[in-house]
């Protein structure tokens, strides 16, 4: 009855502060409307990073000012988070909600630990 959500345990952000990972869910039914939310958990506090609702077969659209982008393919969502700094290192949880048709299902991933290392500033060259 519970919906399983899988995501990688660890991802290392690029030197440009971009991290990508796949969030895959085992849909118990044939959902047509799905909401995907990325949550960040730090010190047992959970905050929303970004969220998008999409119709199956359509593109995943985050708000214009969102730090996330993504694409969907079947029960798989490819998520990219940009603009990350070292202080953003933490556990990023993929939350999937099957909104329509009934019944509603909630799926919570175990989280992806994203490590972000700020690039060293380039030395001045004379």
């Amino acid at each position: 009855k519970a919906m399983h959500v899988a995501q990688p345990a660890v991802v290392l952000a690029s030197s440009r502060g971009i991290a990508s990972f796949v969030c895959e869910y085992a849909s118990p039914g044939k959902a047509t409307e799905v909401r995907v939310t990325v949550l960040r958990q730090a010190d047992s506090q959970v905050t929303e990073v970004c969220a998008a609702t999409y119709m199956m077969g359509n593109e995943l659209t985050f708000l214009d000012d969102s730090i996330c982008t993504g694409t969907s393919s079947g029960n798989q969502v490819n998520l990219t988070i940009q603009g990350l700094r070292a202080m953003d290192t933490g556990l990023y949880i993929c939350k999937v909600e099957l909104m329509y048709p009934p019944p509603y299902y909630l799926g919570i991933g175990n989280g992806t630990q994203i490590y972000v290392i700020d690039p060293e500033p380039c030395p001045d060259s004379d």
Partner: antibody, heavy 118, light 108 residues
Framework: QVQLVESGGGVVQPGRSLRLSCAAS????????MHWVRQAPGKGLEWVTF????????YYADSVKGRFTISRDNSKNTLTLEMNSLTEEDTAIYYC???????????WGQGTLVTVSS | EIVLTQSPGTLSLSPGERATLSCRAS???????LAWYQQKPGQAPRLLIY???SRATGIPDRFSGSGSGTDFTLTISRLEPEDFAVYYC?????????FGQGTKVEIK
């Protein structure tokens, strides 16, 4: 701080209607799904209805389907429950509740009492 | 619909004792989707435990949750006077959202 304040309860005759409201404050209302839960006198908790972020998706308990309508106004941070064809079995304290990020009902209002009696 | 059955219906204990409350589901509930609430007379329910074993903000560590599949447990290690109340389990993984019928923890 997060606050949910219900209003609109009262005494109503069987077959009549009542409209409950829940005023939300202290959080970004549109970022959360919401529920109504009721509790008959001396009884346990019964989930009544759910509404999605934008109000497009609604789910109801079988006991109220076709009689109750949930809605929300994200511009006014308000959740509403329209109750029609009320019966004595609908007598209860009605709570609005917020769904937390990970799914449980993390904040509840103080409740409003609805009494259906002739 | 997932039916949750709580036992016992009433638990009579003294302050300082350990309380063990059970919640059994009619079908498997992922541990991520099981919560416990506390309700005192005249008050709204308060979230205690979510995800079967994570304590909600501000909940003392004498409250702990465990279990998986169909069997879940709420344990209060040492009862304080303010812990005497009714406790409900809830599943929130799929609609309809369901609650157990409650366990009343009363002073012996």
């Amino acid at each position: 701080q997060v606050q949910l304040v219900e209003s609109g309860g009262g005494v109503v005759q069987p077959g009549r209607s009542l409209r409950l409201s829940c005023a939300a404050s202290g959080f970004t209302f549109s970022s959360y799904t919401m529920h109504w839960v009721r509790q008959a006198p001396g009884k346990g908790l019964e989930w009544v209805t759910f509404i999605s972020y934008d109000g497009n998706n609604k789910y109801y308990a079988d006991s109220v389907k076709g009689r109750f309508t949930i809605s929300r106004d994200n511009s006014k941070n308000t959740l509403t429950l329209e109750m029609n064809s009320l019966t004595e079995e609908d007598t209860a304290i009605y709570y609005c509740a917020r769904t937390g990020w990970l799914g449980p009902f993390d904040y509840w209002g103080q409740g409003t009492l609805v009494t259906v009696s002739s | 619909e997932i039916v949750l059955t709580q036992s016992p219906g009433t638990l009579s204990l003294s302050p300082g004792e350990r309380a063990t409350l059970s919640c059994r589901a009619s079908q498997s509930v992922g541990s991520s989707y099981l919560a416990w609430y506390q309700q005192k007379p005249g008050q709204a329910p308060r979230l205690l435990i979510y995800g079967a074993f994570s304590r909600a903000t501000g909940i003392p560590d004498r409250f702990s949750g465990s279990g998986s599949g169909t069997d879940f447990t709420l344990t209060i290690s040492r009862l304080e006077p303010e812990d005497f109340a009714v406790y409900y389990c809830q599943q929130y993984g799929s609609s309809p959202w369901t609650f157990g019928q409650g366990t009343k923890v009363e002073i012996k």
